[in-house]
């Protein structure tokens, strides 16, 4: 396969809800009309898959199986959103693009986007 | 009907090279990827590469880069596979087969396979 | 390189009998995946493919399933003709790899 520049944001705080969006973008070399976009998670030296979504050009993106995450793709660049996040879910995000059609396949894997999850403190309880 | 017709059975010495072809009909050539397959007892069936007749768009197996070299001629409607300097190794059956109708993310299928040419190398 | 493995390499059933074949991929596929058959001295033919979609003409004993990584193909009722080799193959990221096949024959 032939290799593909992606650029994501180095650092991204998730909001107190536990939703943290980011943009990945690849400088796509050839007229795809088939796009996967996959969120890979590394921590520890692990590396596990968060989601994947594929779609043609000009359509919504379509994220396989129980996803936690949504999107949407404008030309070379796709918004993504992750959901549900905690603390424990710090890390750093690595996106992945394959152009699947047509043939030649490009495969570009971005730095990673370090995405900083801040459980919210619990409410005090107050007497009036 | 759709029917992929590949050429017939190749006995090569080793060291030279072979081209293979399977001729498409029934269908649009360029409206569907061609892709090419290997079988042998020893590795079972192995994706080789693929090519678009319509862009001329080649994606390889890594394993296959630099052995295998995927052609298509439209006005013709044959898809060709030149396999160079051939070893024992190289000894197999080789399929062409056709991808599922493009511009659907969900066609990922070889739904029509040629009928196989079987290649040996010896001396 | 997604390794497909196909633990049973042989099975022996009878005509009429029902048999499972297991596939089982290195990493999450998605449901890309297909099925084939062939017999000896054949080319493959398609069975099943995006995991459990039946191709075109193949009979309704023939069904698959499975997500992830572990995926399967049911034969109900086997028939003479369903004896030889089944081959699953994904196609999630390139190269698309196939099973070492499971051979069916007959008891």
């Known amino acids: 396969c032939k290799a593909m520049h992606v650029a994501q944001p180095a650092v991204v705080l998730a909001s107190s809800r536990g939703i943290a969006s980011f943009v990945c973008e690849y400088a796509s070399p050839g007229k795809a009309t088939e796009v996967r976009v996959t969120v890979l998670r590394q921590a520890d030296s692990q590396v596990t898959e968060v989601c994947a979504a594929t779609y043609m050009m000009g359509n919504e993106l379509t994220f396989l199986d129980d996803s936690i995450c949504t999107g949407t793709s404008s030309g070379n660049q796709v918004n993504l959103t992750i959901q549900g996040l905690r603390a424990m879910d710090t890390g750093l995000y690595i996106c992945k693009v394959e152009l699947m059609y047509p043939p030649p396949y490009y495969l570009g894997i971005g730095n990673g986007t370090q995405i900083y999850v801040i459980d919210p403190e619990p409410c005090p309880d107050s007497d009036f | 009907q759709v029917k992929l017709q590949e050429s017939g059975a190749e006995l090569v010495r080793p060291g030279a090279s072979v081209t293979l072809s399977c001729k498409a009909s029934?269908?649009?050539?360029?409206?569907?990827?061609m892709h090419w397959m290997k079988q042998t007892p020893v590795h079972g069936l192995e994706w080789i590469g693929v090519?678009?007749?319509?862009?001329?768009?080649?994606t390889y197996n890594q394993k296959f880069k630099g052995k295998a070299t995927l052609t298509a001629d439209k006005s013709s409607s044959t898809a060709y596979m030149e396999f160079l300097s051939l070893t024992s190794e190289d000894s197999a059956v080789y399929y062409c087969t056709r991808r599922g109708a493009r511009a659907t993310v969900y066609n990922y299928v070889m739904d029509y396979w040629g009928q196989g040419t079987s290649v040996t190398v010896s001396s | 390189d997604i390794v497909m493995t196909q633990t049973t390499a042989s099975l022996s059933a009878s005509v009429g009998e029902t048999v499972t074949i297991t596939c089982r991929a290195s990493e999450n596929i998605h449901n890309y995946l297909a099925w084939y058959q062939q017999k000896q001295g054949r080319s493959p033919q398609l069975l099943v493919y995006?995991?459990?979609t039946l191709g075109d003409g193949v009979p309704s004993r023939f069904s698959g399933s499975g997500s992830g990584t572990q995926y399967s193909l049911k034969i109900n009722s086997l028939q003479p003709e369903d004896f030889g080799s089944y081959y699953c193959q994904h196609f999630w990221s390139t190269p698309w790899t196939f099973g070492g096949g499971t051979k069916l024959e007959i008891k």
């Open positions: 029934g269908y649009t050539f360029t409206d569907y990827e």
């Open positions: 995006n995991a459990k």
């Open positions: 090519i678009d007749p319509e862009t001329g768009g080649i």
